[in-house]
């Protein structure tokens, strides 16, 4: 007459997080008499899961009617699955006596746990960085299980090649984490671009997770400066500009000095916007050649976000009728001011 | 689905006797097969399970002089040493108690251990 | 071992009455629940009633049920019908295979 066998009939089992895991186990014999347990994992530290016998678990829930007669079915199921709840299950038939003796076991179900990753979280350097420069970016994501997964990178749509990533843990673990370094030159067209982190993993059905920084956060384009002198408004007096272009961003403070000395300081505000995503602003100066004996030189003089100052001159000679002065080149930026200079 | 037990009968003191009980409409193979007697006029007593070869016991009093096989459409059950305490109608069931209770029953078979 | 002691040993009542028949173990059943309610009528075998002290026997009326936990069981027949005239046995289950006695039964006979 054949003994009592513990069936299991799943190797493994995967379910999504959230979900429920049905577990199969049926004995083909009700002898002996004794409770079914279930358990995870196997040796001295197992995990009592459920005991037909005794206990509360409110997580557990019989298939079929336990109480029934002539049940064999011990199929049980595990509510709202966690990835801590990954291992392999073993049915184990006990003989009723003091204590219950384990009679024997099923072969075992692995339950695995399908967990989305976290959103990817981007982030970029802690200071701006100039055009031509080399920046780092990272991306996170987080508690994901299975440990295969798929992470790319993107600029404007373009992929990147230049980055580093890891999966944590090497071994065996409930979750997983994933954390990915890229390099990306900056242009002076970056200001619009953006930096795409994209994960792609079972449990999205192929549809990945996207997390994204503006390069606008991480870039700063520094100004040219261009100082020109304009025909005359009236007599005696001559016009010079200051043309700040293609800077981002906007935070800029402007300068004149004539002959060394500060004559005005001021704050872009009215710029204008590049299709680039920079800025113009141009300061005017109206100077009364009148009231100057000597050549006077002028200087514009522009603070970009904190940085060093750069500036452009121009040479205005007194001498001369102010028809024939030429004018000198400098850099770019816009914005409007007059002053005249007496 | 049910059982039937045979081979009771008058038996003198000290003599053995084999009882049956055949299962008609189920297979015993995944049951225990349980036996309990009954003196006249007196309650139910439970004597032991036949489960499979490793998986037979007995009540510490009918333990050495009751044993037990079974086959997967019949059990018996081997009594020796009889004495006159135990004339009682012999009953079998299917079921080892607790989760698998004793049903359905044999209608009863008469043993009487007389000189 | 185990014991069972069941009360009253015996009891008349009416068609109708509700009857309420005990069973004390002298420890606790296996699993606090091996605890079965058996009814024998004169010259027949025994029928169950009740297992795992509330669970209800395929076919058996919803008038008997059965409650209890532990060493402390009760079988409960709320409406008695002319057929329920019969004696009532608990069969308690203790910690080892063997271990199953019978309580020394209960008599409901007609008033």
């Known amino acids: 007459e054949e003994e009592l066998q513990v069936i299991q009939p799943d190797k493994s089992v995967s379910v999504a997080a959230g979900e429920s895991a049905i577990l199969h186990c049926t004995v083909t014999s009700l002898i002996p008499v004794g409770p079914i347990q279930w358990f995870r994992g196997a040796g001295p530290a197992r995990e009592l899961i459920y005991n037909q016998k005794e206990g509360h678990f409110p997580r557990v829930t019989t298939v079929s009617e336990s109480t029934k007669r002539e049940n064999m079915d011990f199929s049980i199921s595990i509510s709202n699955i966690t990835p801590a709840d990954a291992g392999t299950y073993y049915c184990v038939k006990f003989r009723k006596g003091s204590p219950d003796t384990e009679f024997k076991s099923g072969a075992g179900t692995e339950l695995s746990v399908r967990a989305k990753p976290s959103a990817p979280v981007v982030s970029g350097p802690a200071a701006r960085a100039t055009p031509q420069h080399t920046v780092s970016f990272t991306c996170e994501s987080h508690g994901f299980s299975p440990r295969d997964i798929t992470l790319k990178w993107f600029k404007n749509g373009n992929e990147l090649s230049d980055f580093q990533t890891n999966v944590d843990p090497v071994g065996e673990s409930v979750s997983y984490s994933i954390h990915s370094t890229a390099k990306v030159v900056l242009t002076r067209e970056d200001v619009h671009s953006q930096v795409i982190c994209e994960v792609a993993h079972v449990t999205l059905q192929g549809d990945p997770l996207r997390g994204t920084a503006n390069l606008s956060e991480t870039i700063r384009v520094p100004p040219t400066l261009e100082v020109t002198q304009q025909p005359v408004r009236a007599e005696n007096q001559v016009n010079v500009t200051c043309q700040v272009r293609k800077f981002y961003p906007q935070r800029l403070q402007l300068t004149w000095l004539e002959n060394g000395n500060v004559s005005r300081t001021e704050t872009a505000s009215t710029v204008t916007e590049n299709k680039d995503g920079t800025y113009n602003w141009m300061s005017w100066l109206l100077v009364n050649v009148s009231a100057h004996r000597d050549d006077v030189k002028l200087t514009c003089q522009v603070e970009h976000d904190g940085q060093p100052a750069v500036s452009k001159s121009h040479d205005l000679k007194v001498s001369a009728h102010p028809k024939e002065q030429g004018s000198n080149t400098a850099a770019e930026n816009t914005g409007s001011n007059e002053r005249n200079i007496y | 689905r049910q059982l039937v037990e045979s081979g009771g009968g008058l038996v003198q003191p000290g003599g053995s006797l084999r009882l049956s009980c055949t299962a008609s409409?189920?297979?015993?193979?995944?049951?225990?097969i349980s036996w309990v007697r009954q003196a006249p006029g007196k309650g139910l007593e439970y004597i032991g399970t036949?489960?499979?070869?490793?998986i037979t016991y007995f009540a510490s009093w009918a333990k050495g002089r009751f044993t037990g096989s079974k086959t997967s459409s019949t059990a018996y059950m081997e009594l020796s040493s009889l004495r006159s305490e135990d004339t009682a109608v012999y009953f079998c069931?299917?079921?080892?108690?607790?989760?698998?209770?004793?049903?359905?029953w044999g209608q009863g078979t008469l043993v009487t251990v007389s000189s | 071992a185990i014991q069972m002691t069941q009360s009253p040993s015996s009891l008349s009542a009416s068609v109708g009455d509700r009857v309420t028949i005990t069973c004390q173990a002298s420890q606790s059943v296996y699993g606090n629940n091996d605890l079965a309610w058996y009814q024998q009528k004169p010259g027949k075998a025994p029928k169950l009633l009740i297992y795992l002290a509330s669970t209800l026997a395929t076919g058996v009326p919803s008038r008997f049920s059965g409650s209890g936990s532990g060493t402390d069981f009760t079988l409960t027949i709320s409406s008695l019908q002319p057929e329920d005239f019969a004696t009532y046995y608990c069969?308690?289950?203790?910690?080892?295979?063997?271990?199953?006695?019978f309580g020394g039964g209960t008599k409901v006979e007609i008033k």
């Open positions: 069931a299917r079921g080892s108690a607790w989760n698998d209770p004793f049903d359905p």
């Open positions: 409409g189920f297979s015993l193979s995944s049951h225990g």
């Open positions: 036949i489960g499979t070869g490793v």
């Open positions: 069969l308690g289950g203790g910690d080892d295979e063997a271990d199953n006695v």
